[in-house]
């Protein structure tokens, strides 16, 4: 197991998940850790505990390894980091990678007030309701502004969008979460259409094939201003 040495350390590796950092319960996910060509060992940590290691074969001149999680569950959802060793030196820790498991327990209902088709500048609020008591709700927009909002609530949460702009148009889903990394099934999608304005268009997003596996997003909270969490931006975390 890795020994902490503060003096000489190698640059931190990059960690990311494929196909997504949001994984349906029971599905597999790959965690990639990219370090250096000369790395002799990679170690993956989960919630601060040693999870797995990989020793690349010398014949394969690769600077990254894949850790395969065969079945995602609430027990494997959480924060992952990785390290690599080259010679006698260990790298610094990668940035944290936050893996979320979805598809647990129940399915929330999502609706939009006053209606799914609104005019530019109109006030819009999304409502997410889940029969199972939960601690937090997440509203995600598919392939759009890469932005998640979350709200605390027991059975229902509301997401006021304010006066809408064209940037708000798109398809939304919501989740209830049982903790930050264990989420419900997704709601049915709700598509927000914006009419009026200069370009009189009520187009939905052009790609109708968007799915959970290809969402890229930013996790932020609207409780106390906007706090961005870089580990949820894209599927790769690096600085």
């Amino acid at each position: 197991q890795r020994i902490n040495t503060e003096k000489e350390t190698l640059p931190k590796p990059i960690i990311w998940a494929k196909p997504s950092i949001m994984v349906t319960n029971g599905n597999s996910v790959n965690i990639w850790c990219q370090g250096a060509q000369s790395a002799s060992e990679y170690q993956l940590y989960f919630e601060g505990s040693f999870f797995a290691l990989e020793r690349p074969k010398p014949s394969r001149s690769m600077n990254k390894v894949r850790f395969f999680i065969s079945q995602m569950t609430s027990h494997t959802a959480g924060i992952y980091t990785c390290f690599y060793q080259s010679g006698e030196l260990w790298s610094k820790s990668s940035n944290p990678l936050k893996l979320v498991v979805t598809g647990l327990y129940d399915t929330p209902n999502l609706w939009v007030y006053p209606r799914p088709e609104v005019t530019l500048g109109e006030n819009v609020t999304f409502f997410c309701q889940l029969k199972t008591a939960t601690s937090k709700f997440f509203l995600l927009k598919e392939r759009g502004s890469n932005h998640i909002q979350n709200k605390y609530g027991n059975i229902q949460a509301e997401f006021p969008m304010g006066p809408v702009t064209r940037a708000h148009r798109g398809t939304y889903r919501c989740f209830g979460s049982y903790n930050d990394y264990a989420w419900s099934f997704p709601s049915e999608p709700v598509t927000l259409l914006i009419t009026g304005g200069v370009e009189n268009s009520s187009l939905a997003p052009t790609d109708p094939t968007s799915s959970l596996d290809y969402w890229e997003f930013d996790l932020s909270t609207n409780e106390s201003g906007l706090q961005k969490d870089s580990a949820f931006w894209d599927h790769t975390t690096q600085n």
Epitope: F51, A52, L53, V65, R66, S70, T73, T76
Partner: nanobody
């Protein structure tokens, strides 16, 4: 569906040896990463040793140099050779598998394993 059946447990004196076996059903054994865990009475389950699908191994510090993990893909079996046994090695020993897996990964955390055996009891006492 993979089934794991451990055998080889029993009572042994301090300093003695035992070899545990874990027989796996199914054709997926060659693509599985395997591990041994143990749970002593009143304690949490802990990692003992693991082996990748390409025979790379890793051991808990407490058993390093005393225990050896190996696998025989032809027999769909993983072994844990235990020697220089101590009283603190007394526990129920569980075999576990990650199926499928790729590359050369050795899994150390119990959460990574998706198949478990029922366990076999090892008792070390004079």
């Amino acid at each position: 569906e993979v089934q794991l059946v451990e055998s080889g447990g029993g009572e042994v004196q301090p300093g003695g040896s035992l070899r545990l076996s874990c027989a796996a059903s199914g054709r997926t054994f060659a693509s599985a990463a395997m591990g041994w865990f143990r749970q002593a009475p009143g304690k949490e389950r802990e990692f003992v040793a693991a082996i990748s699908r390409s025979d790379d191994t890793y051991y808990a510090e407490s058993v390093k140099g005393r225990f050896t993990i190996s696998r025989d893909n032809a027999k769909n079996t993983v072994y844990l050779q235990m020697s220089s046994l101590r009283a603190e090695d007394t526990a129920v020993y569980y075999c576990a598998a990650v199926v499928p897996t790729y590359g050369n990964t050795i899994y150390v955390h119990s959460a990574a394993y998706n198949y478990w055996g029922q366990g076999t009891l090892v008792t070390v006492k004079p």
